[in-house]
Interface confidence: low
Amino acid sequence: APVRSLNCTLRDSQQKSLVMSGPYELKALHLQGQDMEQQVVFSMSFVQGEESNDKIPVALGLKEKNLYLSCVLKDDKPTLQLESVDPKNYPKKKMEKRFVFNKIEINNKLEFESAQFPNWYISTSQAENMPVFLGGTKGGQDITDFTMQFVSS
């Protein structure tokens, strides 16, 4: 069955962009001008999951890379990672739960809640050049709000 996808970039509410930091990590920092080309382009796929009017289940792959953001337990803590997948089989409508995020839109801002670990969100630090991570608090120091920009394929 087809899975609908669109290409986009994400910026946190402080306008920090997301870039690759090594092969399996993302970091958030302010970019300007030509440096904007460094930001990662996501292929956001609309997948199966528990749905409600305000929660849309999505998977976040890196465009033209066989890497997906996934949520796993590491040392008993929910952790965000970039996971390599077989490109012949992904994306698919029925993604494993660790790949699924509930995209929540509030006042034109987006949050991405882990479907595997409810109330844990894709987060960035206030500080520059720090890893993107899975955070268990909202409304504190860490940033959980993002905006989405469409990218032509």
Epitope: P2, L6, F46, E51, I56, F150
Partner: antibody, heavy 120, light 107 residues
Framework: QVQLVQSGAEVKKPGASVKVSCKVS????????IEWVRQAPGKGLEWIGE????????NYNEKFKGKATITADTSTDTAYMELSSLRSEDTAVYYC?????????????WGQGTLVTVSA | DIKMTQSPSSMYASLGERVTITCKAS??????LSWFQQKPGKSPKTLIY???RLVDGVPSRFSGSASGQDYSLTISSLQYEDMGIYYC?????????FGGGTKLEIK
């Protein structure tokens, strides 16, 4: 409010081409799939294909590949469908409709339809 | 292609009557099903998507349900303005396919 306004009726000779437009207003054009559906006289509905203007993704019904070409112009918030090598069996009302790109893909709004008549 | 078999192809019903129209999918469509109403000479109007989600502004007398690969549209109490042709659509697999339609007329 959301509106999809299609171009007017067309009469074409067999072998000719026709380009139907669908001008969208009332929402962010790039964020919604535009669907194209046809209805031959007295018949049911048939899905032709779709385009997501935000990134140009297009999906066609295999039956209409080579017959229909779907495009979108984000500068004018207009989607187009061109039909080539017209035959009498292409006589139909052609509809555009939109679906919200990320919520269950439920068709929500429809254009008024464009009647294309193919006649020698 | 997935075949959507809609029944009945036409029916008469009385005002106030409960009416049910069904669509049977030839394979699993994962509840990706919409219902439309079309009146003569008019564009289709979306009533329901994802089996049972009512589009804004659609009267609550319309409802949708599923049992396996059988999908139903029910009008709890038929009104005069409900006459028209009803279509189902599966949008799980390309090409998306419509049912053949059910012509609903007032008795």
């Amino acid at each position: 409010q959301v509106q999809l306004v299609q171009s007017g009726a067309e009469v074409k000779k067999p072998g000719a081409s026709v380009k139907v437009s669908c001008k969208v207003s009332g929402y962010t054009f790039s964020r919604y799939w535009i669907e194209w559906v046809r209805q031959a006289p007295g018949k049911g509905l048939e899905w032709i294909g779709e385009i997501l203007p935000g990134n140009g993704n297009i999906n066609y019904n295999e039956k209409f590949k080579g017959k229909a070409t779907i495009t979108a112009d984000t500068s004018t918030d207009t989607a187009y469908m061109e039909l080539s090598s017209l035959r009498s069996e292409d006589t139909a009302v052609y509809y555009c409709s939109t679906i919200y790109y990320d919520y269950d893909q439920g068709f929500t709004y429809w254009g008024q339809g464009t009647l294309v008549t193919v006649s020698a | 292609d997935i075949k959507m078999t809609q029944s009945p192809s036409s029916m008469y019903a009385s005002l106030g009557e409960r009416v049910t129209i069904t669509c049977k999918a030839s394979q699993d469509i994962d509840r990706y099903l919409s219902w439309f109403q079309q009146k003569p000479g008019k564009s289709p109007k979306t009533l329901i998507y994802r089996v049972k989600r009512l589009v804004d502004g659609v009267p609550s007398r319309f409802s949708g349900s599923a049992s396996g690969q059988d999908y139903s549209l029910t009008i709890s109490s038929l009104q005069y303005e409900d006459m028209g042709i009803y279509y189902c659509l599966q949008y799980d697999e390309f090409p998306y396919t419509f049912g053949g339609g059910t012509k609903l007329e007032i008795k």
